[in-house]
């Protein structure tokens, strides 16, 4: 036997070994070096376990392949230097291309899975956000229903309303006396007399339970019936559309009286203290406020995928009783405008276009503008800065009932100024309104300067939507306030009224509104420094009752597929205030303007059921002088939107609302008007006792955004 048994028969010629750092031959490409256990980096924070594992495996494989490729590169280098490789190294080198391909594939795979992982994360977040939105919307919808319910219950204290409901609009009774009594009893549960032995929140906790059970339609007994039965009764009232239409229970002043008391516009001009004109390019540093309004919408709008029942709680079609009848031109003759973007009726189109572009540059909003209106009613002059969305249908019937007292048109909605903003379903297109009045088109000359305005803070601003008080002397305005002294939504002549917003543009009177938003536009990010400083100037005191934003938000044409965009946009980032240019004007039109109730009159319900009419004098309706939310809708009640995407919650707003000391632009305080008949009134609901100015549901604080 050979003495060299230990030098055995190897398969390779020996030679000086390669540097000890190199790790010899790799025979099989599949033989991977032990992989380290690091999870893949760069993936979403919240990974599904499976995705983490996949990425971990890929990452491990990737590192093995990279290590292997590095080795192969080393082998090739050594080969190139003339160094001899052993069989394992040669085997490995022969698989160089395979390893390279595998490496590329693994990298691509890793990229794909990382992207997939991120998509999954986005989807998870979107889903969570959507669920949150749906929860919020459900809550808002519930709140809206509560408000509607509160409104109806409140109105049922009105003898005329009770009579109407018992007789029915077309002879078919809506409610029986027994049902009215049930509702009266329930009313006492949800709006109890203040029991000073109970803490307020305890007292309202009981009330809220009753309301909740009613909304749920529970079979539990209450007031000699069940919540379910009560809910059906209330739904019947809602579905009757009784409160959506005009009822001539008017007891205010009629046109002769009002006309007699109305000072001329010239007088008004003399009294006005217009703001000093600002260059419209300046940025207002004053805290801006975002107001939201999505009250008046068609049923189909903003529905999140599923069509709402039209008959649920309320019918969505808003019939604006005070149709935009021909505004008497004489009521507000053309007067010099302190802040006019368009100096005269029709300036050079190029100039106008340039101004629009300048304005848009400032606004930095993602809205698409068109030069002229889609609807050119009565050849009115058109503001160039018209926000474009889907054109409204001009063929809809423009006929609306004539006002009983046309002259009252200009002010009779005053007392209802705080009604609409209740909207839990209001379109939350946040509007930034600053006090600086630059480039506001028709600046009302009667607007008191901010310096002179004192807002009597009689009680905390606990309304659902801001109801800003006017000048103190205006606060006590009665229904006989002269038309010219009321906030005019538009002026005659060349001045162009601001557009009302949130109004159901399907209603005939609103067909002539030109400006609508393209709701598909993306929302500008909130972190832009301009966001809260935009000079969205509005007419300083146009009537709030229909508008919290100076532009009509056209939502009727929204398609279902657009909904996701809108919802995603508005809800997706609650920190993104949606800037809306505030000075788009609307040409004077005979059939256009903000609806006013045909006459001021008392809601015949009185201060509280069984209360004295006298006690209700200036309030006309629902709350005391503290300007709390209960005003409005004397002649009709525009139904609250019942869409599921009911508005985008106030949590969007990033700063506290502060209405101290000055009138917020574009908002009419909700003072109650009216003097006149006072007298005892029966208590059909057993609600005797002193007036209850806080007749409404528990109030909520409003938010203001800086």
């Amino acid at each position: 036997p050979s003495a060299t048994s230990h030098s055995g028969s190897g398969s390779k010629s020996s030679g000086p070994p390669p540097p000890s750092g190199s790790s010899g031959s790799e025979a099989a490409a599949g033989a991977a070096a032990p992989a380290s256990q690091h999870p893949a980096t760069g993936t979403g924070a919240v990974q599904t376990e499976a995705m983490k594992q996949i990425l971990g495996v890929i990452d491990k494989k990737l590192r093995n392949l990279e290590k292997k490729k590095g080795k192969l590169d080393d082998y090739q280098e050594r080969m190139n230097k003339g160094e001899r490789l052993n069989q394992d190294q040669l085997d490995a080198v022969s698989k160089y291309q395979e390893v390279t391909n595998n490496l590329e594939f693994a990298k691509e795979l890793q990229r794909s899975f990382m992207a997939l992982s991120q998509d999954i994360q986005k989807t998870i977040k979107k889903t969570a956000r959507r669920e949150q939105l749906m929860r919020e919307e459900a809550e808002q919808k519930r709140l809206k229903t509560v408000l509607e319910l509160q409104y109806v219950l409140d109105k049922l204290g009105d003898d005329d309303v009770r009579t109407d409901l018992k007789q029915g609009l077309s002879g078919v009774p809506i409610l029986s006396e027994e049902e009215l009594s049930l509702l009266d009893e329930f009313y006492k549960l949800v709006d109890p007399e203040r029991d000073m032995s109970l803490r307020l929140n305890e007292q309202y906790e009981h009330a809220s339970i009753h309301l909740w059970d009613l909304l749920e339609g529970k079979e539990k007994p209450v007031c000699g019936t069940t919540y379910k039965a009560l809910k059906e009764i209330v739904e019947r009232v809602f579905q009757s559309n009784y409160f959506d239409s005009t009822h001539n229970h008017q007891n205010g002043l009629c046109e002769e009286e009002e006309a007699a008391s109305a000072p001329t516009v010239e007088d008004q001009v003399a009294e006005a203290e217009p703001e000093p004109a600002e260059e419209y390019t300046e940025q207002s540093e004053v805290e801006s406020t975002e107001y939201v309004n999505r009250q008046f919408m068609a049923e189909t709008q903003f529905s999140s995928g599923e069509k709402e029942q039209v008959d649920e709680w309320t019918v969505e079609t808003v019939e604006v009783v005070n149709s935009l009848q021909q505004q008497p031109q004489a009521a507000s003759p053309s007067v010099p405008e302190p802040h006019s973007l368009t100096p005269v009726a029709q300036s050079d189109p190029l100039v106008r276009r340039q101004r629009v572009q300048d304005l848009m540059a400032q606004m930095q909003g993602p809205y698409n503008f068109i030069q002229d209106s889609m609807l050119d009613f009565e050849n009115q002059t058109l503001d160039p800065a018209i926000v474009s969305a889907q054109p409204m249908n001009p063929t809809q019937n423009m006929d609306m009932p004539q006002l009983v007292c046309p002259q009252v048109h200009s002010e009779s909605r005053l007392a209802q100024s705080n009604q609409v903003p209740v909207q839990p379903e209001a379109t939350q297109v946040p509007l930034v309104s600053s006090t600086s009045e630059g480039y506001t088109a028709s600046q009302p000359l009667y607007q008191p300067s901010h310096a002179t305005e004192q807002r009597p803070q009689k009680e905390p601003m606990d309304q659902i939507q801001a109801t800003i008080s006017l000048n103190t002397d205006q606060t006590t305005a009665s229904s006989s306030l002269p038309a010219a002294s009321q906030p005019q939504v538009f002026q005659a002549g060349t001045s162009k009224p601001l557009h009302s917003s949130g109004i159901n543009v399907n209603a005939a009177p609103f067909q002539s509104m030109q400006t609508v938003f393209n709701m598909n536009a993306p929302v500008p990010p909130a972190n832009e420094p301009e966001t809260l400083k935009q000079q969205s100037q509005y007419q300083a005191t146009y009537n709030q009752s229909f508008s919290s934003q100076p532009h009509q938000v056209e939502q009727t044409e929204l398609q279902q597929d657009q909904l996701q965009t809108v919802v995603g946009t508005y809800h997706g980032s609650q920190d993104q205030p949606h800037q809306v240019p505030g000075n788009h004007q609307q040409p004077p039109q005979q059939n256009t303007g903000f609806p006013r109730s045909s006459q001021p009159y008392y809601n015949s319900r009185g201060v509280s059921r069984g209360g004295s009419r006298g006690a209700r004098g200036l309030m006309n309706g629902y709350r005391g002088p503290a300007n709390g939310f209960r005003g409005g809708y004397d002649g009709y009640r525009p139904s609250f939107s019942n869409t599921p995407n009911s508005g985008y919650s106030q949590s969007q707003f990033t700063a506290p609302r502060d209405y101290s000391g000055y009138q917020r632009d574009g908002y009419q305080q909700n003072f109650k008007r009216g003097s006149g008949q006072s007298g005892p009134r029966g208590a059909p609901r057993g609600r005797g006792g002193p007036p209850r100015p806080n007749r409404g549901m528990p109030q909520m604080n409003t938010q203001q955004v800086n």
Epitope: K12, S13, P17
Partner: antibody, heavy 112, light 112 residues
Framework: QSLEESGGDLVKPGASLTLTCTAS?????????MSWVRQAPGKGLEWIAY???????TAYANWAKGRFTISKASSTTVTLQMTSLTAADTATYFC??????WGPGTLVTVSS | DVVMTQTPASVEAAVGGTVTIKCQAS??????LAWYQQKPGQPPKRLIY???NLDSGVPSRFKGSGSGTDFTITISDLECADAATYYC??????????????FGGGTEVVVK
């Protein structure tokens, strides 16, 4: 892929013998080392020589130099020529591609 | 030529136990070392290459380590099938000096 050794026989001491390693399923190309290893009965493995097919370079164990010659006979065969055989050369002879693929071996017995 | 010394020549262990075999090179061979398992009547089967890399199909119970001159193979969780003779081999090649692909003397593993 497989290897098979052939040519093993019973020979007398001093005789010569040529063993052949035939590849199946592949052919010898530039990136293979072909080796011969032997194992005497009940003993350990003993490396004899290798040839690098790429450039024909060969290497031998010190004890095998001069008596053993490795060469590539064709694209699928490698041979080991043995001369001056002695009883100590009695063993099973394996051919291997690199050190991974081995043939079953062929027995060479040197006996008088 | 490099000389490979393998210890122990024989080792006995119970099923489920662990066996460690050492291999020492007479000079540094970096990590150019392979380990083989051979059962009677069969050609050797490579288990590990480059001192620590497991060949495909080889259970992870086999673990190789070491570099330079000292190398070990550890077989854990011994199974009956692991009963065999284990060899180490220098696999270094170089154009300059011939190291030779010498084998170690082998270690017989007996599983009880």
């Amino acid at each position: 892929q497989s290897l098979e050794e052939s040519g093993g026989d019973l020979v007398k001491p001093g005789a010569s013998l040529t063993l052949t390693c035939t590849a199946s399923g592949f052919s010898f190309s530039g990136s293979y080392y072909m080796s011969w290893v032997r194992q005497a009965p009940g003993k350990g493995l003993e490396w004899i020589a290798y040839i690098y097919i790429g450039d024909g370079v060969t290497a031998y164990a010190n004890w095998a130099k001069g008596r053993f010659t490795i060469s590539k006979a064709s694209s699928t065969t490698v041979t080991l020529q043995m001369t001056s055989l002695t009883a100590a050369d009695t063993a099973t002879y394996f051919c291997a591609r690199g050190n991974k693929l081995w043939g079953p071996g062929t027995l060479v017995t040197v006996s008088s | 030529d490099v000389v490979m010394t393998q210890t122990p020549a024989s080792v006995e262990a119970a099923v489920g136990g662990t066996v460690t075999i050492k291999c020492q090179a007479s000079q540094s061979i970096s990590s150019y070392l392979a380990w083989y398992q051979q059962k009677p009547g069969q050609p050797p089967k490579r288990l590990i290459y480059d001192a620590s890399n497991l060949d495909s199909g080889v259970p992870s119970r086999f673990k190789g380590s070491g570099s330079g001159t000292d190398f070990t193979i550890t077989i854990s969780d011994l199974e009956c099938a692991d009963a065999a003779t284990y060899y180490c081999q220098c696999t270094a090649v170089s154009s300059a000096t011939i190291y030779g692909n010498a084998f170690g003397g082998g270690t017989e593993v007996v599983v009880k």
